[in-house]
């Protein structure tokens, strides 16, 4: 699902109070809910009738440093026999999310958000009817 | 997928270097890649075969605002005649993000990063064997 | 945090009838299915009954079918156990609870559990 555009105004300070200096912004440090954790049922990208593989994607100037993408396995479904069915259509389910971007020079060191694409699993599909009959 | 505990380092300077004053960071305004955006295939929430409903949640002092869940609709899957079979499982697939919580007592504002469980989706699975018979 | 109340057990004799009621609290946004299960002085505790708060679809342990009937209320954000036909063997401390993971959760995947109910079910 989509993020909307922040056009700013969350960042700014209300129009009665000075701006804000050099265009940043003081972020604490930590993290709320830190410890909370994705506790999804076990395998279940092998268990799908649309199965996915994940690739680990690493960078130390982001945080989280490990973003892990999925891959649907099919171009269709796997059917009870085990079998790949081509009239039904695996397909990626996508979430914008925000990462953190490390810059540094130096001592001084900013940070900036990051808006990244992921895509979290695969569903299987009744596909749409149209120009490829 | 889970986000890795941040143990703080990486928003701490080199050793070498000053501590961050008052335990906060710069961060610098605006959203790199801002204007990329999730690509989907078109009604998959309903075209699946284990569909799902959406409900936004609102939050004016959180960045994103909305925040977007995914419920799954059946117990079981939707099978080629557009009926429930309850012998396969809708299962949810969740991503851990990370979102900016605002937090201002007149005009001092500032900023942490929060950690939020979204429900993207859902997949159908086959069971595993256990005490649902 | 989940709060889960049950109600409605108590002692009944066999061929006789029960409806219990749980109220949840605290839900996640995204939970979508809710359980009754039960357990039985000296057993495991057991899956009964698991209903979909959206479609009102619903499963039920081979134990239990025809003659246990799982509704639920949205508004309110209660579901019910209607029990007929009672035998004694139904005799157990009933709960509910959410499924996160709907007909895929496991046992170990609670966290936390209500007080539960008794069912007494008398010859």
């Known amino acids: 699902r989509k993020i909307p555009k922040v056009g700013h105004t969350f960042f700014q300070k209300p129009e009665s109070c000075p701006p804000v200096p050099g265009g940043s912004m003081k972020l604490d440090i930590g993290i709320i809910n830190e410890n909370q954790r994705v506790s999804m049922s076990r395998n279940i990208e092998s268990r799908s009738t649309s199965p996915w593989n994940y690739t680990v994607t690493w960078d130390p100037n982001r945080y989280p440093s490990e973003v892990v993408q999925a891959q649907c396995r099919n171009l269709g479904c796997i059917n009870a026999q085990g079998k790949e069915d081509i009239s039904m259509n695996s397909v990626p389910i996508q979430q914008e999310t925000l990462v953190v971007r490390r810059k540094h020079q130096g001592c001084s060191v900013s940070f900036q958000l990051e808006k990244v694409l992921v895509t979290v699993g695969c569903t299987c599909v009744t596909p749409v009817i149209h120009h490829v009959q | 997928r889970k986000i890795p505990k941040v143990g703080h380092t990486f928003f701490q300077k080199p050793e070498s270097c000053p501590p961050v004053p008052g335990g906060s960071m710069k961060l610098d305004i605006g959203i790199i890649n801002e204007n990329q955006r999730v690509s989907m295939s078109r009604n998959i929430e309903s075209r699946s075969t284990s569909p799902w409903n959406y409900t936004v949640t609102w939050d004016p002092n959180r960045y994103p605002s909305e925040v977007v869940q995914a419920q799954c609709r059946n117990l079981g899957c939707i099978n080629a005649q557009g009926k429930e079979d309850i012998s396969m499982n809708s299962v949810p697939i969740q991503q851990e993000t990370l979102v900016v919580r605002r937090k201002h007592q007149g005009c001092s504002v500032s900023f942490q990063l929060e950690k939020v469980l979204v429900t993207v989706g859902c997949t159908c699975v086959t069971p595993v064997i256990h005490h649902v018979q | 945090q989940v709060q889960l109340v049950e109600s409605g057990g108590g002692l009944v004799q066999a061929g006789g009838s029960l409806r219990l009621s749980c109220a949840a609290s605290g839900l996640a946004v995204s939970s979508y299915a809710m359980g009754w299960f039960r357990q039985a002085p000296g057993k495991e505790r057991e899956f009964v009954a698991a209903i979909s708060w959206i479609s009102g679809g619903t499963k039920y342990a081979d134990s239990v079918k025809d003659r246990f009937t799982m509704s639920r209320d949205n508004a309110k954000k209660q579901v019910y156990l209607e029990m007929n036909s009672l035998k004694p063997e139904d005799t157990a401390v009933y709960y509910c609870?959410?499924?996160?993971?709907?007909?895929?959760?496991?046992?170990?995947?609670?966290?936390?559990w209500g007080q539960g109910i008794q069912v007494t079910v008398s010859s």
């Open positions: 609870n959410d499924m996160p993971y709907g007909l895929d959760t496991r046992m170990d995947d609670y966290k936390y």
